[in-house]
């Protein structure tokens, strides 16, 4: 084994190095000392380190470690943050387009419904946006509310245009009749299925991206233990105490120390791998009724079909509703 | 992807959104993200090595520091912890992760469970025996002559048509919504049961 080079007789080199870490403080001995109070850089002979220096080295080592960790995750963190923002904005744009497509359909095909239809369509798509962002709304309720609101307007404006301005009484009866008589056939059910599946997947996709950011942030800002600080100090700075300024740690030794310091963080690995693979599976399945873009941008056409279905069955419906809501109607005219 | 009837969206701006095929779409962007994320799949297991390679370690030098003394880079002592008695590296590992790390692991477990549930083959959760549209083949109302049809021959084309980033700032207002000059569903000449509904019957009148 080669003999260690003789330590700097005056600790001058060590002082100039240490001054960079802690300018102005006179913690470096003028000449090598026994160092019996040292706890980390235990000397085999005289040393140029003091207890205070050792503490400063530990602090610096932990800070270095935190910075290294942050720079290690910078690219990954940026990737997820940027994509989470981009997808959230894109989903909002899809919702906005879907709303405008639906409004355009009403404006072009059912102008007599438009003022109220715009309002109900607006409320529906607001709920869609809120749901994607994590709001505790039931999708089936959203769809039911849309059709419950639309039917009285369709009935009074399209099916029975001669009726006086509808009053609350008949509207409530019509809302009830809408479900009891399956006025829109199976269209609401189709929309519920498609919207709930596509929005569920979209919501989980965004949740997963946001959790990804949280994972990186958590490991990014980890505070390393005192034990780790001591190991890092010994690896990075104890050589200075012997005046070995240009010597670097051995690679294998560094790996052992890092694995020790990061034992907790590395435990995330298994779940992180699973996270990426599960996210990939989800993304691979995001098509057809699991793709909110496909579903929401096609919603106007399904709503259009549902209104046509009502119109085709208008005869039967008008008779049945006439009997069902006659009481409300009489009260309205009284 | 969703079907956009030309006769409803005659505004050229909208057609641009509706019919772009080769530009970046949401689904292509999602796949691109996954490919990039997959390059980070070993991020946590590779961290110790990454940090060592980004902090000063002896690469070309003959001698290196093992925590206690200068040694030859390829000697057995190079990898060994020079101060075994100071504190035990094994103990440090045995302590287990910090509470914040345990917490984040629990959250990862939870989201992984959700992701798996959502992407089980055939979709997923309780959708066994469902056709591609998400309905059972015989999903007919008891008192209705109705069923939801299967996907059929290319019923929904799998092609996202929203221009992704290029259109991110583009907002289509209802006022822009085309169709003032052309009906989406022009009525047949005179054939409309509703034209005459007033005369047909209305039990509520």
């Amino acid at each position: 084994q080669p003999p260690p080079p003789p330590p700097d007789a005056t600790c001058h080199q060590v002082r100039s190095f240490f001054q960079r870490l802690q300018p102005g403080l006179k913690w470096v001995p003028e000449t090598p000392v026994p160092g019996s109070d040292l706890q980390v850089c235990l000397p085999k002979g005289p040393t140029c380190c003091s207890r205070k220096m050792e503490e400063k080295y530990q602090l610096t080592a932990r800070l270095n470690m935190e910075q290294l960790l942050q720079s290690a995750s910078m690219e990954l963190k940026f990737l997820i943050i940027q994509n989470a923002a981009v997808f959230q904005e894109a989903f909002e744009i899809v919702v906005r387009h879907a709303k405008n497509y639906t409004n355009a359909m009403f404006k072009n095909n059912y102008p007599s419904l438009t003022p109220q239809a715009f309002e109900f369509v607006g409320e529906f798509f607001t709920d869609v946006s809120l749901y994607i962002l994590g709001s505790d709304i039931n999708v089936d309720d959203m769809v039911n509310e849309l059709f419950d609101s639309l039917f009285p307007v369709i009935y009074t404006q399209l099916m029975n245009p001669g009726l006086p301005d509808s009053a609350l009484d008949i509207n409530e009866c019509l809302r009830g009749a809408r479900r009891d008589l399956k006025v829109f056939g199976n269209f609401p059910k189709l929309i519920m299925t498609q919207v709930s599946k596509s929005l569920q997947v979209t919501r989980i996709f965004l949740q997963a991206l946001n959790l990804g950011i949280e994972v990186i942030n958590t490991t990014d800002h980890l505070k390393f233990s005192k034990d780790c600080g001591r190991m890092l100090t010994r690896m990075w700075y104890c050589s200075y105490c012997q005046g070995l300024m240009m010597v670097k740690p051995c690679g294998g030794y560094c790996n052992v120390v890092m694995q020790g310091c990061m034992a907790g963080v590395v435990e995330i690995d298994k779940y992180w791998r699973e996270y990426i693979l599960s996210l990939e599976e989800l993304v691979n399945g995001m098509y057809r009724i699991y793709d909110m873009e496909n579903v929401l941008l096609g919603l106007f056409s399904t709503i259009h079909d549902s209104i046509q279905y009502v119109q085709k069955n208008a005869g039967k419906l008008t008779t049945t509703i006439g009997k069902l809501c006659a009481h409300s109607q009489q009260r309205q005219y009284r | 992807s969703a079907y956009y009837p030309e006769d409803l969206f005659i505004d050229k701006k909208v057609l641009k959104v509706a019919h772009v095929e080769h530009e970046e779409t949401l689904s292509s962007r999602r796949r691109e993200l996954i490919q990039k994320l997959k390059s980070f799949i070993s991020f946590y297991s590779a961290l110790p090595g990454y940090i060592c390679s980004h902090s000063p370690v002896a690469e070309n030098d003959t001698l290196c520091w093992n925590g206690q003394e200068l040694v030859e880079r390829y000697s057995q002592k190079a990898a060994r912890n020079g101060m075994k008695n100071q504190f035990n590296l094994h103990e440090l590992k045995m302590k287990g992760p910090e509470p914040v790390v345990s917490q984040i692991i629990d959250k990862l477990k939870h989201i992984n469970q959700l992701l798996r549930t959502m992407s089980m083959p055939k979709g997923r959760v309780l959708d066994k025996n469902l056709d591609e549209e998400g309905f059972e083949a015989g999903d007919c109302g008891d008192d209705e002559d109705e069923c939801i049809g299967g996907a059929g021959d290319g019923m929904i084309k799998v092609k996202n048509q929203l221009r992704f980033l290029a259109e991110l700032a583009y907002d289509l207002d209802v006022d822009d919504a085309p169709g003032n000059s052309q009906q989406a569903t022009p009525k047949d000449n005179e054939i409309s049961t509703f034209h005459n509904l007033g005369n047909v019957h209305s039990p509520l009148k």
Epitope: Q311 | D7, G152, T185, I191, T193, V200
Partner: antibody, heavy 119, light 107 residues
Framework: QVQLQQSGAELARPGASVKLSCRAS????????ISWMMQRTGQGLEWIGE????????YYNEKFKGKATLTADKSSSTAYMQLSSLTSEDSAVYFC????????????WGQGTLVTVSA | DIQMTQSPASLSASVGETVTITCRTS??????LAWYQQKQGKSPQLLVY???TLPEGVPSRFSGSGSGTQFSLKINSLQPEDFGSYYC?????????FGGGTKLEIK
């Protein structure tokens, strides 16, 4: 002008399936429902069911559930009807017809497809 | 389902005559009734809807009447091209049903 072009005559064995097509032109395919009718030789018309090409939702006459399956391909503006487990009872002319947007009225019809089921 | 009963099942008439075909429904369908004409080997053609409305292009010698459960189709001054089969159909709701048909032959 509105046209519905149906596929040619089919000869099938009992137990087999056939798939009839109805190609629409002259209007926006997704704006109207397509209905299918059956007419046995020298008899009246029976409504089998209809499909809304936009959403793919179908409505069937109770009598034809399990016998007929309606689908539509928007890209080719074509509606299809598959008849399964054929028996001699299914020998008939099958028509597709386009309705109006607000009623079960059929102003436009295909020319009909003769299906003959014979061993 | 609503049952449609047409009568007569067949009738013979000469060119220039007036004929009436009737259709009875099993329940009140108000005015939601259509009539179709079908010639041998051809597809049906819509003649009347909403019980009495003629689509564009249908000659005025055809007229429909009735409401509720009783309906009729009247053809004034029969022309050679009027011979064939006639079907009534309700468009009151799902499922639409057709009558058994009336075969109109040249005497």
């Amino acid at each position: 002008q509105v046209q519905l072009q149906q596929s040619g005559a089919e000869l099938a064995r009992p137990g087999a399936s056939v798939k009839l097509s109805c190609r629409a032109s002259g209007y926006t395919f997704t704006s109207y429902g397509i209905s299918w009718m059956m007419q046995r030789t020298g008899q009246g018309l029976e409504w089998i069911g209809e499909i809304y090409p936009r959403s793919g939702i179908t409505y069937y006459n109770e009598k034809f559930k399990g016998k007929a399956t309606l689908t539509a391909d928007k890209s080719s503006s074509t509606a299809y009807m598959q008849l399964s487990s054929l028996t001699s009872e299914d020998s008939a002319v099958y028509f597709c017809a386009r309705d109006v947007s607000d009623g079960y009225l059929f102003p436009y019809w295909g020319q009909g497809t003769l299906v003959t089921v014979s061993a | 389902d609503i049952q449609m009963t047409q009568s007569p099942a067949s009738l013979s008439a000469s060119v220039g005559e007036t004929v009436t075909i009737t259709c009875r429904t099993s329940e009140n369908i108000y005015s939601y009734l259509a009539w179709y004409q079908q010639k041998q080997g051809k597809s049906p053609q819509l003649l009347v809807y909403n019980a009495k409305t003629l689509p564009e292009g249908v000659p005025s010698r055809f007229s429909g009447s009735g409401s509720g459960t009783q309906f009729s189709l009247k053809i004034n001054s029969l022309q050679p091209e009027d011979f064939g089969s006639y079907y009534c159909q309700h468009h009151y709701g799902t499922p639409p049903t057709f009558g058994g048909g009336t075969k109109l032959e040249i005497k």
